[in-house]
């Protein structure tokens, strides 16, 4: 058959939960301390909460059924009677009472024809302000008749026909009734919630609703123009040209900021936005949802997208509606012909209308922002240059911040890219130019996106002119080739000598993408003398082992994830892992990761890595003396030719360093 509507699916779930109590029993969740009842969906059933409030489960007859004394559950279908009597069956006795008062309406309800009545519950009538009720019952009850006719449709309409966003023609002057049927199974009629649906009558159907509904006459734009509290909003809408949309056809939700909401914003910020058509349009669009959303539809947190593109978390806490967790909605469900308005007393400024400073204020990068400000770079973060700010997280500076000197200023200038970027468009190998004149490289890994040694730690915040990238560490631009890095650090003097004697200098000086696991002098000294002599006594062997320390792509620590198998220039793979923020290669910890070079990255290690081929038994273990001598004679020529390499001047440097 046809797909079930969300309402029917929720009803089905409630029936399922109630079936152990007998046939046609539905589980109902009642919010403690109120009379609000809901058929229950799966999520609510397990959370036992509606709008953050605890609920109790009760078991009632499903719509259209009744109990039979002495029998389990609700085995009997309700007897069909006319609409008037069915009002009594569903508990809408006040509607019956007011129907009687109109004199004309009861005969219609009892007579031939086919109607739908959206009948307000007794509580709905009782909650009407006294003056409204008075005006309905005065004027020879004509207002009451009109009000009741507005709750009626001249044909039978069941819930499976109530589609989201549809309008029904009422029996009062053919005025429209707005229907919304939400994915969570809630159905609203002019934002009044359907409590008990599909109660059949001989001449139609009754749906019980939780409010008395009234005709909708104004569109959203007209409401903005009428209400004094929207004076600032009115001016902003006019300036942005959005009034055409807000008076046109469609179904929108306007989260309408009151004058008070605008007053909470610093005048400098407000004037900047109001004076910038694009920022203003984004600001207003961030208050408009693409469909009508009645307050009654919200029973738990819900992510909704604004016309501007930002996602808002709409939720509820008891009777209060919340946006992004804050109860800022002061008046809800003001109906318009083209949607619904909720008054809000805080402005929802989207990122797209903010400066870099404003973006950063809501991110965990305040320490970095203070540094930029102290370094005299503040004008870049509040101006209209197209920039991307690479701002390290506050946690990066937990051990203190650097003094603001020329070096720090330059470093900070290299955290500002001369273009407004979006991380989703960055690609591996891309270069980005900084205000400091450096070219930074982009590295794309399976689970991270890095710029040099620093990786993006949070979603971009794209502002009006600048984008904020929150980074996981201070970015260090490369200062030279891998060879320059090694030569410039006296911890690597033995490695440099070894690289030179192995003929790898040119490789590590030319353009390329290398990850070098660089053993310190201590690492060489820590080798057993035999292994050190094997390594340094044979140029070919030395080159082989050194190549095993060089990966054939750039792998910064942020790109490792849990485990990466990195192919070395020697051919075997290196197992690089990250655990508890410590990088390891072949299970040995890296002493200092991420020293960036123009052609790669250097990770400092305190041990010399041994390729798999170097780990098996030695010749001496298996060969007898005579066999060894034969082997040596056979390889005498190759050794003789290598001797000149072994005695190369570079070894003289090593000699001094290796001396015990």
């Amino acid at each position: 058959g046809p797909a079930k509507s969300p309402y029917q699916l929720v009803l089905q779930h409630s029936r399922l939960r109630g079936r152990q109590h007998g046939p046609n029993v539905c589980a109902v969740q009642k919010v403690i301390g109120t009379n609000r009842k809901y058929f229950t969906n799966c999520k609510q059933w397990y959370q036992r909460k509606i709008c953050g409030k605890s609920t109790v489960i009760s078991y009632e007859c499903c719509p259209g059924y009744e109990k039979v004394p002495g029998e389990k559950g609700c085995p009997a279908a309700l007897p069909l009677s006319n609409l008037y009597e069915t009002l009594g069956v569903v508990g809408s006795t006040t509607t019956q009472l007011y129907t009687d008062r109109t004199e004309k309406l009861r005969p219609e309800m009892e007579g031939p024809g086919s109607f739908t009545i959206f009948a307000p519950s007794n509580e709905a009538w009782a909650s009407l302000p006294a003056e409204v009720l008075d005006s309905l019952v005065s004027n020879v009850n004509i207002e009451l008749l009109n009000a009741l006719r507005y709750h009626m449709v001249g044909r039978r309409v069941l819930t499976d026909e109530l589609k989201h966003g549809m309008t029904l023609t009422s029996m009062y002057q053919n005025s429209n009734i707005q229907i919304h049927h939400y994915p969570n199974g809630i159905v609203t009629v002019n934002c009044a919630r359907l409590l008990k649906a599909d109660h059949h009558a001989t001449n139609g159907v009754v749906h019980l609703i939780d409010k008395v509904i009234s005709t909708i006459t104004n569109n959203i734009q007209q409401i903005i123009e009428i209400e004094d509290t929207f004076e600032t909003l009115r001016a902003a809408v006019a300036a942005s040209g959005l009034n055409t949309m807000l008076e046109g056809n469609g179904q929108y939700t306007l989260l309408a900021p009151t004058n008070e909401a605008f007053e909470k914003i610093p005048s400098e910020t407000l004037n900047r936005i109001l004076g910038d058509p694009e920022a203003l349009r984004d600001l207003l669009n961030n208050h408009i949802l693409k469909s009508a959303m009645c307050a009654e539809a919200i029973v738990a947190g819900l992510s909704v997208e604004t016309l501007e593109g930002t996602t808002l978390e709409v939720g509820c806490s008891g009777d209060m509606l919340t946006i992004n967790g804050k109860a800022i909605i002061s008046n809800k469900d003001i109906l318009a012909t083209n949607g619904v308005i909720h008054y809000i007393d805080e402005l929802l400024i989207p990122d797209s209308a903010k400066t870099l400073f404003e973006l950063a204020a809501e991110s965990d990068v305040s320490t970095a922002i203070d540094l930029f400000r102290q370094a005299g770079l503040g004008n870049h973060l509040s101006g209209s240059e197209r920039l991307t700010l690479l701002a390290p997280l506050n946690s990066v500076f937990k051990d203190g911040t650097p003094p603001i000197d020329a070096h720090t200023r330059n470093l900070l200038r290299n955290h500002i890219i001369k273009d407004q970027l979006a991380s989703k468009y960055l690609y591996h190998g891309q270069t980005l130019e900084t205000l400091g004149g450096k070219k930074l490289r982009v590295f794309v890994y399976r689970n991270s996106l890095c710029i040099e040694n620093s990786c993006i730690a949070a979603h971009d915040k794209r502002g009006r002119y600048g984008t904020l990238f929150t980074m996981d560490r201070v970015l260090t631009p490369p200062m030279g080739t891998v060879m320059d890095v090694l030569k410039g650090d006296n911890r690597f003097s033995m490695l440099v000598a070894a690289i030179q004697s192995a003929g790898l200098t040119e490789t590590l000086n030319r353009e390329g993408v290398y990850t070098v696991f660089a053993p310190t002098n201590e690492a060489f000294r820590a080798l057993p003398p035999r292994e050190r002599s094997r390594l340094l006594g044979d140029a070919k062997e030395l080159a082989n082992i050194l190549k095993y320390h060089i990966g054939d792509e750039i792998l910064v620590s942020g790109g490792i994830g849990a485990l990466v198998r990195l192919k070395s220039l020697q051919g075997d793979k290196l197992e690089v892992s990250l655990k508890n923020n410590v990088v390891s290669v072949n299970k040995e910890p890296v002493a200092e990761p991420d020293i960036m070079a123009t052609n790669g990255v250097v990770h400092v290690i305190t041990n010399v890595l041994q390729p798999p081929a170097n780990r098996p038994q030695e010749r001496g273990d298996e060969l007898a003396d005579s066999a060894l001598e034969i082997f040596k004679q056979a390889s005498a020529f190759s050794r003789a030719s290598q001797r000149s390499v072994r005695l190369a001047p570079v070894y003289q440097k090593l000699l001094e360093r290796m001396k015990h």
Epitope: P529, R530, R532, R615, R643
Partner: antibody, heavy 120, light 113 residues
Framework: QVQLVESGGGLVKPGGSLRLSCAAS????????MYWIRQAPGKGLEWVAT????????YYADSVKGRFTISRDSAKNSLYLQMNSLRAEDTAVYYC?????????????WGQGTTVTVSS | DIVMTQSPDSLAVSLGERATMNCKSS????????????LAWYQQKPGQPPKLLIY???TRESGVPDRFSGSGSGTDFTLTISSLQAEDVAVYYC?????????FGQGTKLEIK
Amino acid sequence: QVQLVESGGGLVKPGGSLRLSCAASGFTFSDYYMYWIRQAPGKGLEWVATISDGGIYIYYADSVKGRFTISRDSAKNSLYLQMNSLRAEDTAVYYCVRGWDRYDSWFACWGQGTTVTVSS
Amino acid sequence: DIVMTQSPDSLAVSLGERATMNCKSSQSLLYSSNQKNYLAWYQQKPGQPPKLLIYWASTRESGVPDRFSGSGSGTDFTLTISSLQAEDVAVYYCQQYYRYPYTFGQGTKLEIK
């Protein structure tokens, strides 16, 4: 077969010098690490110095560093130990020792030793 | 420096009996990259230079009788002579070649009971 013959030992006054030599035969001298090891009268063994096959890498015990110099002459198949500023505690039998192979290793072949006595 | 300690200092064993001596190093001699122990055993008979018996803690030098065997790993090592012969009377030294300076144990003197 492998032969290592030490010479140059003798009696010397404290502060004096001696040069020990070791003549190697029966193997390709330039393919092996070589060592000097000593043994004081009635005592255990003590490593003194190491020189690599090409003569590039040299290591000394702290007790002789700055006073002794190990060297080799592959053309003459000879190993040397120049001992200066000799002390009474340098009195020992000095053994010339060949390593297992062209890499630094254990002490595979030993000479008969030459005695050095430092006494006034 | 790595300190090598041998025990016992002297040992008297009957001919044909098993002789066992121990050597303990102040730090591990096991190199994780190749899983080898950098330890050798030497025999020195009176008036003679020492002679290599065992290297890599357990590999017998060619020409050494198979009654000699080495075992152990890390810091604790053992030299065993399965059936003592008269010509085995000597002082036995262990030596580490894991770190400079290379160091020897003080020796274990083996005699016939």
